[in-house]
């Protein structure tokens, strides 16, 4: 029961996390124009991983994609790569974890297989979450560096008159979505790994003991026979094949929700 809940919750948390990573990757507001202590402009600039946008005071918004690949900063390319790797790993992890869920019956899949799949998906979620956190953190570091560089340039003018006011950029909503989503995916992955330990059949329970019954003798090897008559069978593991809908084992799905600012 606790294992099923842990596994189910881990799956849901990871699902929300991966949805968040996808949303963050697609969002345009990775960096937004800093409005504090800046000459107030009638346009608002913000940038994403794939395009930059300008919103005029009328609400008119124009976005331009980064149509060059070689001309983009290496750091931006690295962030893109980290986010995509995170999404791909997360998606594979979700696919694997669906089949690994204890509450879902797929043929005569053994518990050991489910345990391995749960561990695999858990590791994938952990790596996915780390990729997202790393990607967002690299971008944030890039912003901080550029922010202070542009601040320094802002107050140094030629001949006492600044001809151009540099637009400074600060953290956008996508960064926070990415951090939270990466964290959730990481937590979900850890939960899956914890659930895996509970799923794994404990071999120490079944020693090689010879039972002398009247009439005939049956030797039980470690792990027991799955196709036995029921005597001494692993009822703990067998409960999964009941097929009946049991409310305590059902995984409640929480809707994925994230605000696009």
């Amino acid at each position: 029961m606790a294992v099923t809940a842990c596994q189910g919750l881990g799956f849901v948390v990871s699902l929300i996390g991966i949805a968040g990573i996808i949303a963050a990757t697609c969002m345009d507001q990775w960096s937004t124009q800093d409005l504090y202590n800046n000459p107030v402009t009638a346009v608002f600039n913000y940038q994403g991983l794939w395009r930059s946008c300008v919103r005029e005071s009328s609400g008119f918004t124009e976005c331009r994609g980064y149509f060059t690949l070689l001309g983009l900063p290496a750091m931006l390319q690295a962030v893109r790569a980290l986010m995509i790797v995170g999404i791909v790993l997360g998606a594979i992890g979700l696919l694997v974890s669906i089949f690994a869920l204890k509450c879902i019956r797929i043929g005569s899949m053994e518990d050991s297989a489910k345990a391995n799949m749960t561990l695999t998906s858990g590791i994938m979620f952990i790596v996915s979450g780390l990729c997202a956190i790393a990607g967002v953190s690299v971008f944030a570091n890039m912003l901080v560096t550029n922010f202070w560089m542009s601040t320094a340039n802002m107050y140094t003018g030629m001949g006492g008159m600044v001809q151009t006011v540099q637009t400074r950029y600060t953290f956008g909503a996508a960064l926070f979505v990415g951090w939270v989503a990466g964290g959730l995916t990481l937590i979900g992955g850890v939960m899956m790994c914890i659930a895996c330990r509970g799923l794994a059949p404990e071999e120490t329970n079944y020693k090689a003991v010879s039972y002398h019954a009247s009439g005939h003798s049956v030797a039980y090897k470690p792990g027991g026979f799955k196709a036995s008559t029921g005597f001494g069978s692993n009822t703990k593991n067998k409960k999964i094949y009941d097929g009946g809908a049991r409310t305590e084992d059902e995984v409640q799905s929480y809707p994925s929700k994230h605000d696009y600012v």
Partner: antibody, heavy 120, light 113 residues
């Protein structure tokens, strides 16, 4: 077609207040910024303030903070600008205008102007 | 505030002549993100409100004759009339549409000989 009709000329005493109106038609009033621009006789234009009727948000030229107060009546699609504590230098023609959508923050339609004369 | 300086303050021309007027801003009006200059040109005839001619420095408003051309970038902008007509006699204003508060130039008055 888009139209902005302003109230008639005003002759006021120094220290008094005046409320100018700008009635709009031909477009959705709540979706566009309304600006007010001052033009003193034979001089250039001076941006005073703008209001977004949909939300009531306003941006003032600091020079006119405390001098001008903006309001908008959605039901009649009319913008108002009240000028208080009038001085002789407030004598000017005041234009209301609409900020165009996707036109680089420019004002695409203008009212005919309201002449305000401050005289004792 | 951004200072907009227009030159000359007045121009006396003859019909059919090519006219150029300038507008200089104290700070760049170029937004690097979209490479657009937030400068607007207006035409104001006597007793009338201003009329929008150009936005983004060079984008002609609908209904404006193509003899009018807006150009320039950063801090220096130009309005050119290729062949002046009698109906073009007016005051031409440039406006900073990038920084608050919006500011206007002193205007260039176009007169006929």
């Amino acid at each position: 077609q888009v139209q902005l009709k302003q109230s008639g000329p005003e002759l006021v005493r120094p220290g008094a207040s005046v409320k100018l109106s700008c009635k709009t038609s031909g477009y959705i009033f709540t979706n566009y910024w309304i600006h007010w621009v001052k033009q003193r006789s034979g001089q250039g234009l001076e941006w005073v303030v703008r209001i977004y009727p949909g939300t009531g948000n306003t941006y003032y030229n600091e020079k006119f903070t405390g001098k001008a107060t903006l309001t908008a009546d959605k039901s009649s699609s009319t913008a108002y600008m009240q000028l208080s504590s009038l001085k002789y230098e407030d004598s000017a023609v005041y234009f209301c205008s609409r900020e165009g959508y996707g036109k680089g923050n420019s004002m695409d339609y203008w009212g005919q102007g309201t002449s305000v004369t401050v005289s004792s | 505030d951004i200072v907009m300086t227009q030159s000359p303050s007045s121009l006396t021309v003859t019909a059919g002549e090519k006219v150029t007027m300038n507008c200089k801003s104290s700070q760049s009006l170029l937004n690097s993100a979209n490479q657009k200059n937030y400068l607007t040109w207006y035409q104001q005839k006597p007793g009338q409100p201003p009329k929008l001619l150009f936005y983004w420095a060079s984008t002609r408003e609908s209904g404006v004759p193509d003899r009018f051309t807006g150009s320039g970038s950063g801090t220096d902008f130009t309005l050119t009339i290729s062949s002046v007509q009698a109906e073009d006699l007016a005051v031409y204003h440039c406006q900073n549409a990038y920084y608050y508060p919006y500011t206007f130039g002193g205007g260039t008055k176009l007169e006929m000989k």
